[in-house]
Interface confidence: medium
């Protein structure tokens, strides 16, 4: 489908959220990685959000282009442009059967438009199943859930999160592929809005069943550190965050809804170039322990939890955190063992409705970013306890930081 | 309160021209797509043409060339210029605002429309 | 283009009694399917959208389900003003697409 004069310059329908009316954009600044060396002979990969900045050794220039990283949640490997893998992580959409393959025209015709899509798999992200996702024309797939109104801009999985405008070209496409073991989004020919003589992006982001995720880069026509991220964030990587309700101050019988960005991985926009690949393969996490013993005697670099009422296993830092408030699971745990649960009955679960989110020890990892419901200034909320930059780098992933309470 | 209100149909012969008029109120029209969605006598709705807050444009096939969408944010109105007339282009046309909001980075998502006009009768015959 | 489907064209149903209306899409739309309520005379109404979330204002008897090429709207049990005609619509892909309509007709 062709747009018409004037189309692709704008919103169009694509689908997703639900709510009635307008509800302002939630104008997000982008903050920066550092971007520092520590040393002259390693290459910092990425700002991990979760365990501080993370400079790992690298051979020399001439003998390797890999670069791997440890980001508590994922591990991930930079292939450059010289490396065989590269080639083999990337998709060939064009071969693979027409039938699993759909080129999404609203989203191909657009600006600014996502669209959401059922996953023919339960992909783990952040070691949740999640089945829908929604794609963005702007490089990047909310992993948030839409239906209640959720999709934030902390649940991302981004290969090249710009301002693309697929409307711009008839040949810009959005493209994706789901065979029952792996989702791609291939992002073709799309140009940059207001850059459009730099050329088209041709890249991909792959979500593997088992977790992994894959981003593959074909045709990057420029420098990403020179893409402006005036008009939009510019950046590579992942993040997950958790929402919580609080009680509202002005109105005692509403809830507040603060969104806690727990993790996040930012690449090194100057490593994404022509032909290069990066792969995350998923770490253990708490939520993958099915028993208390499993839970317990896990060695993963979580501490993880055991809550008899929702036989769980959990650090208290994911999406279900505030269930592990509600039901009182941070003050179950402390102290006892697995078999001083073997006589209770967890069938009988009910919120502990005099426990209070206040009550619970939410501290950060490191960083955090709040996004309060009910501001109407900017959205984002750095925590205050941290460096200027919002960044604690000197703490590693289970260092607790600052307890911070959610809400204004 | 939130109202569309349709104006400009009736009767036109095969060939010939209408232009159809859509003042909305009680919302911010400039943030909104608007469409037009047509009913023929006693059929379904059919879905003709979108025109996004930017004046992006898209039609149906069955309209694609005859009928042109626009729209004046200062004047809170949608237009629909139908020419090149036909017998099948008979029916009720609506007026529709788009069911949407923005999210994250000011992504915007669509999800029906959520607001109609009474709709006017466009006839085309000799 | 993406063609729906419903079935059945006419429904007759007592007042009290639960309908069920079927609407099928020619390919996936995922969950991007609204239902629409139209009462003669009347411009229709938006009654679910994302295939299974309300609109505002929209008694809880209306329920919708389905994703991918199969959806349902329930109306739990029918009232006097629920008699009307009922149109699902696709939003995953251009052109935006309608079902022909099932009629609910007092039995």
């Known amino acids: 489908l062709s747009p018409q004069p004037g189309a692709g310059h704008d919103e169009g329908p694509g689908s997703g959220w639900a709510a009635k009316g307008t509800v302002r954009g939630w104008n997000r600044r982008a903050r920066e990685s550092p971007g520092h060396v520590s040393e002259p002979d390693r290459t910092q990969l990425s700002q991990d959000l979760g365990g501080g900045t993370l400079a790992m050794d690298t051979l020399p220039d001439n003998r390797t282009r890999v670069v791997e990283d440890n980001h508590s949640y994922y591990v991930s490997r930079l292939y450059g442009p010289s490396e065989p893998h590269s080639r083999e992580l990337w998709v060939d959409v064009a071969e693979a059967n027409r039938s699993q393959v759909k080129i999404h025209t609203i989203l191909s015709n657009t600006h600014r438009q996502a669209s959401r899509v059922v996953l023919s798999f339960d992909f783990p992200f952040y070691g949740h199943p999640l089945r829908q996702i929604t794609i963005a024309t702007g490089g990047f797939i909310f992993m948030g859930d839409v239906i209640h109104r959720m999709l934030t801009a902390t649940q991302y999985v981004a290969p090249l999160m710009a301002n693309f405008n697929p409307g711009y070209s008839d040949n810009s496409t959005v493209v994706y592929f789901d065979n029952g073991t792996v989702f791609v989004v291939q992002w073709d020919h799309v140009y940059l809005q207001g850059w459009e003589d730099k050329g088209s992006f041709t890249f991909q982001a792959a979500l593997h069943h088992d977790g992994r995720i894959v981003f593959a880069y074909k045709e990057i026509p420029m420098s990403v550190p020179e893409i402006s991220s005036s008009q939009h964030p510019v950046k590579t990587g992942l993040s997950d965050a958790f929402m919580i309700l609080n009680p509202s101050p002005d109105v005692p019988e509403s809830r507040r809804r603060s969104i806690f960005e727990y993790h996040r991985i930012e690449l090194d926009p100057s490593k994404v170039t022509s032909m290069s690949a990066v792969e995350f393969t998923p770490l253990p996490t708490c939520l993958q322990h099915r028993s208390c013993d499993a839970c317990m005697s896990s060695d993963l670099t979580f501490n993880c939890s055991w809550c008899h009422v929702l036989q769980r296993c959990s650090s208290g830092f994911d999406r279900y955190r505030q269930e592990w408030m509600d039901y009182g699971c941070a003050q179950e745990a402390e102290g006892r063992m697995c078999e001083d649960f073997q006589d209770e009955d967890h069938d009988s679960a009910s919120p502990d409705t005099s426990f209070s989110p206040y009550d619970g020890d939410l501290t950060t990892t490191s960083s955090s970013l709040f996004i309060d419901s009910l501001t109407t200034e900017d959205d984002t909320k750095l925590n205050p306890y941290a460096g200027g930059d919002g960044l604690q780098n000197n703490l590693s992933p289970k260092t607790k930081g600052t307890p911070v309470h959610l809400g204004t | 309160e939130v109202q569309l209100l349709e104006s400009g149909g009736g009767l036109v012969q095969p060939g010939g021209s209408l232009r159809l008029s859509c003042a909305a109120s009680?919302?911010?029209?400039?943030?909104?797509?608007m469409s037009w969605v047509r009913q023929a006598p006693g059929k379904g709705l059919e879905w003709v043409s979108t025109i996004y807050r930017g004046a992006g444009t898209y039609y149906a096939d069955s309209v694609k060339g005859r009928f042109t969408i626009s729209r004046d944010n200062s004047k809170n109105t949608l237009y629909l210029q139908m020419n090149s007339l036909r017998a099948e282009d008979t029916a009720v046309y609506y007026c529709?605002?788009?069911?949407?909001?923005?999210?994250?980075?000011?992504?915007?998502?669509?999800?029906?429309?959520?607001?109609w006009g009474q709709g006017t009768l466009v006839t085309v015959s000799s | 283009e993406i063609v729906m489907t419903q079935s059945p064209a006419t429904l007759s149903v007592s007042p009290g009694e639960r309908a069920t209306l079927s609407c099928r899409a020619s390919q996936s739309v995922y969950t991007n399917l609204a239902w629409y309520q139209q009462k003669p005379g009347q411009a229709p109404r938006l009654l679910i959208y994302?295939?299974?979330t309300r609109a505002t204002g929209i008694p809880a008897r209306f329920s919708g389900s389905g994703s991918g090429t199969e959806f349902t709207l329930t109306i739990s049990s029918l009232q006097s003003e629920d008699f009307a005609v009922y149109y699902c619509?696709?939003?995953?892909?251009?052109?935006?697409?309608f079902g022909q309509g099932t009629k609910v007709e007092i039995k």
């Open positions: 619509q696709q939003y995953n892909d251009w052109p935006l697409t």
């Open positions: 529709a605002r788009d069911a949407s909001w923005y999210g994250p980075f000011s992504y915007y998502y669509y999800y029906g429309f959520d607001v």
């Open positions: 009680g919302f911010t029209f400039s943030n909104y797509a």
């Open positions: 994302d295939a299974s």
